[in-house]
């Protein structure tokens, strides 16, 4: 689709005759019959295949025609075909005197026609206009023309249609030779994909419009290159969505359980070593002089009374040390400075000199003791109630009350430790006089069967693809490390062929 | 392709069991952990047991301690979780599912869940 333009601008009749020679009275008043048809070698008479148009009067005689295409239209003149320009045509321009108003072919005399001239070749579509100049022996015509396409058609024969535009169906304006060309931001042969945020994850990621990158399910980030976790993985990451692979010290499906406890945690005090004991668990070996579960005790060296006779006992850095109470001497206060000339003996006790008498020793009479005999005698001062049993007197005779766990008159035996069930990984419990026993089945040692002996579950070379193998301590089984490109138990999956989810 | 399917959920009154099944296909059976999840309506997902692949290590969670069994047939690539004492509180859906190595820790392939409701 397409417009053929004539521009008319000079045509010259001096003598202001017809073409039959007659003059026109009282001038030539000429208009302008325009025809526009298919190519012929001999330009004939017939139908304006192409189309045909006429002017009103633009002049007398000799005149300039002025360029009206602002004011109406009418010049340059507007030959419109909706169909594919041929890149041929050929031209009638026929000059005409009305001596009246009405310019209808059936409304003039036959000899009104002033000039005719017929011209055909070839007109490529473009915006350059060609000038040509007909002229006969008593006419001249000058006027230019050309063939553009209508809007929105494009191409070397005005045949390619194409609208700009900006909505769902499309984003773009129209090249010269009637292409898309997309506007920024879109790409798709008719521009209605956009192009996301650069780095966009392509599978991962998407886009309703240009610069944006909105992530698919399980899929997070900017860039919609970070799978979501397992919902309530704890200490975990992903590969793949709804993944949760421990992070290292962890355990349990959703990774909230502590393997690594002495790490995360340091609960041992005083310099005493840790020891990862299973989920959340760990035992504290203490450095001499501590005790508790953590070492948080510090023990002091007078809790054993090593002053004697009444000595008191002070803590020190490097141990301890004994303040003797007069006239006693010695490491422990143990040696005496009296003799039994000083009578030293109470409660009725008999003195024996020893050492030459250099010193003394007091036999004391029943219910009495101490170095003078100075104490009614404590029958727990001996602490007979053992494992931490507390000693009542009650007159002549004592009592043990036990702490929980144990049992007898001395808190000597202990309440079956076995009920607890403190074997791991399978042990049999025994029951002994000191406390308990456990016997561990193969592959576990320790007091309590918690310690794995090694097995080399990686011996048979289970992973392939040349992933690196471990033997995992708390299963007795291998893991496997794959190589970047590999995954499953044993590496034997290539990334190429990823799992699939039931969701 | 691994897949993990759950069965023998339902409605179960209080004080009342139920046995789940896990069927397992896909991958080498012997060679993976499976475990159990749970997950009730508002609520994030709680891991409730696992056993190794060899089943000579299973664990618990506190909640279910005592109540809940969990075992395996190697055989029959298939886990089981057997449920006692049910309280309303075990109201959830129960999912199987395997860290994709023998020892428990962490998720790797999850299957469709079963729902098992404790009610009067």
């Known amino acids: 689709s397409g417009v053929f333009q004539l521009q008319l601008q000079e045509f010259v009749n001096e003598r202001g005759v017809l073409a039959s020679g007659r003059p026109c009275e009282p001038g030539c008043r000429t208009f302008f019959r325009v025809c526009l048809k298919h190519f012929q070698a001999v330009v004939s008479p017939g139908p304006c295949t192409f189309g045909s148009v006429s002017t009103p009067v633009l002049g007398t005689n000799s005149f300039a025609v002025r360029d009206d295409s602002s004011g109406g239209g009418r010049n340059p003149l507007q030959l419109p075909f909706n169909f594919t320009w041929p890149g041929t045509f050929s031209l009638i321009i026929e000059a005409w005197h009305a001596p009246g108003d009405d310019l209808r072919p059936e409304a003039l005399p036959p000899d009104a026609l002033i000039s005719k001239i017929a011209i055909q070749g070839s007109l490529a579509v473009g915006q350059n206009w060609l000038l040509d100049e007909q002229t006969s022996t008593l006419t001249r015509l000058r006027y230019s023309y050309r063939v553009i396409c209508s809007d929105n058609y494009y191409g070397d024969n005005c045949s390619r249609l194409c609208k700009k535009r900006n909505d769902h169906f499309g984003h773009y304006v129209c090249q010269p030779d009637g292409n898309l060309s997309c506007l920024p931001g879109w790409t798709g042969e008719y521009c209605q994909q956009p192009i996301c945020l650069s780095g966009c994850h392509e599978q991962n990621g998407y886009c309703s419009k240009p610069a944006e990158c909105l992530c698919r399910p399980g899929w997070q980030g900017r860039l919609c290159n970070e799978c979501i976790p397992h919902n309530g993985c704890r200490h975990g990451t992903c590969s793949t969505p709804w993944q949760c692979t421990c992070d290292e010290g962890w355990g349990g499906l959703f990774c909230d359980q502590d393997l690594n406890y002495c790490t995360h945690h340091s609960p041992c005090k005083n310099g005493a070593t840790c020891s990862n004991s299973g989920q959340r668990s760990y035992t504290c070996t203490c450095r001499p002089g501590y005790t508790g579960v953590d070492c948080e005790l510090e023990l002091s060296e007078c809790d054993s009374n090593p002053c004697r006779n009444g000595g008191s006992c002070k803590d020190q850095e490097d141990g301890y040390h004994c303040l003797c109470p007069p006239g006693y001497y010695g490491l422990h206060c143990e040696h005496s400075t009296l003799s039994c000339a000083d009578s030293p003996c109470f409660n009725g006790g008999s003195c024996r000199e020893r050492n030459q008498g250099a010193s003394y020793a007091c036999e004391c009479p029943p219910n009495f003791t101490g170095s003078n005999c100075e104490k009614k005698v404590d029958r727990c001062t001996s602490n007979p109630c053992a494992n931490g049993g507390q000693c009542l007197n009650r007159g002549p005779s004592r009592m043990c009350r036990c702490r929980p766990g144990f049992t007898g008159t001395y808190c000597e035996r202990h309440v079956s430790d076995c009920a607890r069930n403190p074997c791991a990984h399978g042990g049999t419990c025994h029951d002994l006089e000191s406390g308990l026993m456990c016997t561990c089945p193969a592959g576990f040692s320790g007091r309590r069967c918690e310690v794995r002996t090694s097995i080399d579950a990686c011996a048979s070379s289970p992973c392939f693809n040349r992933a690196t193998c471990y033997t995992d301590l708390s299963t007795d089984t291998f893991v496997c490390n794959c190589p970047y490109g590999f995954v499953g138990s044993r590496c034997e999956f290539p990334v190429g062929l990823p799992p699939s989810f039931p969701w | 392709e691994v897949q993990l399917v759950e069965s023998g959920g339902g409605l179960v009154q209080p004080g009342g069991s139920l046995r789940l099944s896990c069927a397992a296909s896909?991958?080498?059976?012997?060679?993976?952990?499976i475990g159990w999840f749970r997950q009730a309506p508002g609520k994030e997902p709680e891991g409730i047991s696992c056993?190794?692949?060899?089943?000579?290590?299973?664990y618990y969670a506190d909640s279910v301690k005592g109540r809940f069994t969990t075992s395996r047939d190697n055989a029959k690539n298939t886990v089981y979780l057997q449920m006692n004492s049910l309280k309303p509180e075990d109201t959830a859906v129960y999912y199987c599912?395997?860290?994709?190595?023998?020892?428990?820790?962490?998720?790797?392939?999850t299957g469709q869940g079963t729902q098992v409701t404790v009610s009067s």
């Open positions: 056993i190794s692949s060899s089943g000579g290590i299973t």
């Open positions: 896909g991958f080498t059976f012997d060679d993976y952990a």
């Open positions: 599912a395997t860290p994709g190595i023998a020892a428990c820790r962490g998720i790797h392939y």
